[in-house]
């Protein structure tokens, strides 16, 4: 299998975990945390970033403690330096984790789902338009 | 070939302690989390442990939590279940398995246990 | 914790037959959290479908898994003698399997 589709798969991957999650929004810590939403064009690694660093938590209630704790942890897998560097290449434009809108764990997760479906759609796209840069 | 070879079965009196290898061979051990199962006679499956591929998190089914310990040796691509305080219901033929997500982002990643070792009978009787 | 319960417990089927198997959960469960094992006496499980329904490397195509939120089914198409085992739901995350169904020859 290309390393693309291993890609895409592992992106469709993230999208179920945070769908695991929010079956499980009650058993989380009600913090609020930063949830880039609208996120501009070339700064969707950066907001994938900030979300990845998001201090998600289980509330230890006992019950759903061990899925969500694998869960929130494969969601922080770190993809490939190859992606890291297009992150980097947009860095300094992006706008820093603190300034995205602080959400509840429920919205959280569903702004993280969208923009993942929207960085799934970019790369399709690129890739039918024959982009390298996906 | 990709394999998981368990070891360290046997009899012992309740109360006793026991320490379960799995040796991994044919694929990069270091890359994937890790699974210790059994089945008592005539039972069902029961997921007894796992850890992560780095050693980072483990997990333990109530059951035995408390009294068994789940550790790896990447460096000799072995896994270990050190098993304190046995009991009778204890009694089981334990498995190892490869958890199926690999670290690796283009890795395996499938949401299972994807390789099984055959199995190591314990026996906990007085 | 979630609890998974399979149906029937015991299927008496023929070679050639259809076999449909259930498992339900006490709870929502994401597709991709919903594997199926085969074990056969005296050897260890063996990893059929994740993901609710892709087939694992090396697995027929006559077994297929479906199902979506709490009801997740699994199909042999066309029993063949090899089939006839013990089948576990599993859900990834908490590892938790159900007590299995048993297919057996009629």
């Known amino acids: 299998m290309q390393g693309q589709d291993r890609h895409m798969i592992r992106m469709r991957q993230l999208i179920d975990i945070v769908d695991q999650l929010k079956n499980y929004v009650n058993d989380l810590v009600p913090e609020f945390l930063p949830a880039p939403e609208d996120v501009e064009t070339n700064c969707e690694w950066s907001a994938f970033s900030c979300f990845q660093k998001a201090q998600l938590k289980s509330a230890n209630t006992g019950n759903n403690e061990r899925i969500i704790n694998v869960s929130i942890k494969k969601l922080k897998r770190k993809p490939p330096s190859t992606n890291a560097g297009r992150r980097q290449k947009h860095r300094l434009t992006c706008p820093s984790c603190d300034s995205y809108e602080k959400k509840p764990p429920k919205e959280f997760l569903e702004r993280f789902k969208s923009l993942l479906q929207k960085m799934i759609h970019q790369h399709l796209s690129s890739r039918t338009h024959g982009s390298e840069d996906s | 070939q990709v394999q998981l070879v368990e070891s360290g079965g046997g009899v012992v009196q309740p109360g006793r302690s026991l320490r379960l290898s799995c040796a991994a061979s044919?694929?990069?051990?270091?890359?994937?989390?890790m699974h210790w199962v059994r089945q008592a006679p005539g039972k069902g499956l029961e997921w007894v442990a796992f850890i992560w591929y780095d050693g980072s998190d483990k997990y333990y089914a109530d059951s035995v939590k408390g009294r068994f310990t789940i550790s790896r040796d990447n460096s000799k691509n072995t896994l270990y279940l050190q098993m304190n305080s046995l009991r009778a219901e204890d009694t089981a033929v334990y498995y190892c398995?490869?958890?199926?997500?690999?670290?690796?982002?283009?890795?395996?990643?499938?949401?299972?246990?994807?390789?099984w070792g055959q199995g190591t009978t314990v026996t906990v009787s007085s | 914790e979630i609890v998974l319960t399979q149906s029937p417990g015991t299927l008496s089927l023929s070679p050639g037959e259809r076999a449909t198997l259930s498992c339900r959960a006490s709870?929502?469960?994401?597709?991709?959290?919903l594997a199926w094992y085969q074990q056969k006496p005296g050897q260890a499980p063996r990893l059929l479908i994740y993901g609710a329904s892709a087939r694992a490397t090396g697995i027929p195509d006559r077994f297929s898994g479906s199902g979506s939120g709490t009801d997740f089914t699994l199909t042999i198409s066309r029993l063949e003698p090899e089939d006839f085992a013990v089948y576990y739901c599993q859900q990834y995350g908490s590892w938790t399997f159900g007590q299995g169904t048993k297919v057996e020859i009629k």
């Open positions: 709870q929502s469960v994401s597709s991709s959290y």
């Open positions: 044919g694929f990069t051990f270091s890359s994937y989390g």
């Open positions: 398995a490869r958890d199926g997500d690999s670290s690796d982002w283009y890795g395996d990643y499938y949401f299972g246990m994807d390789v």
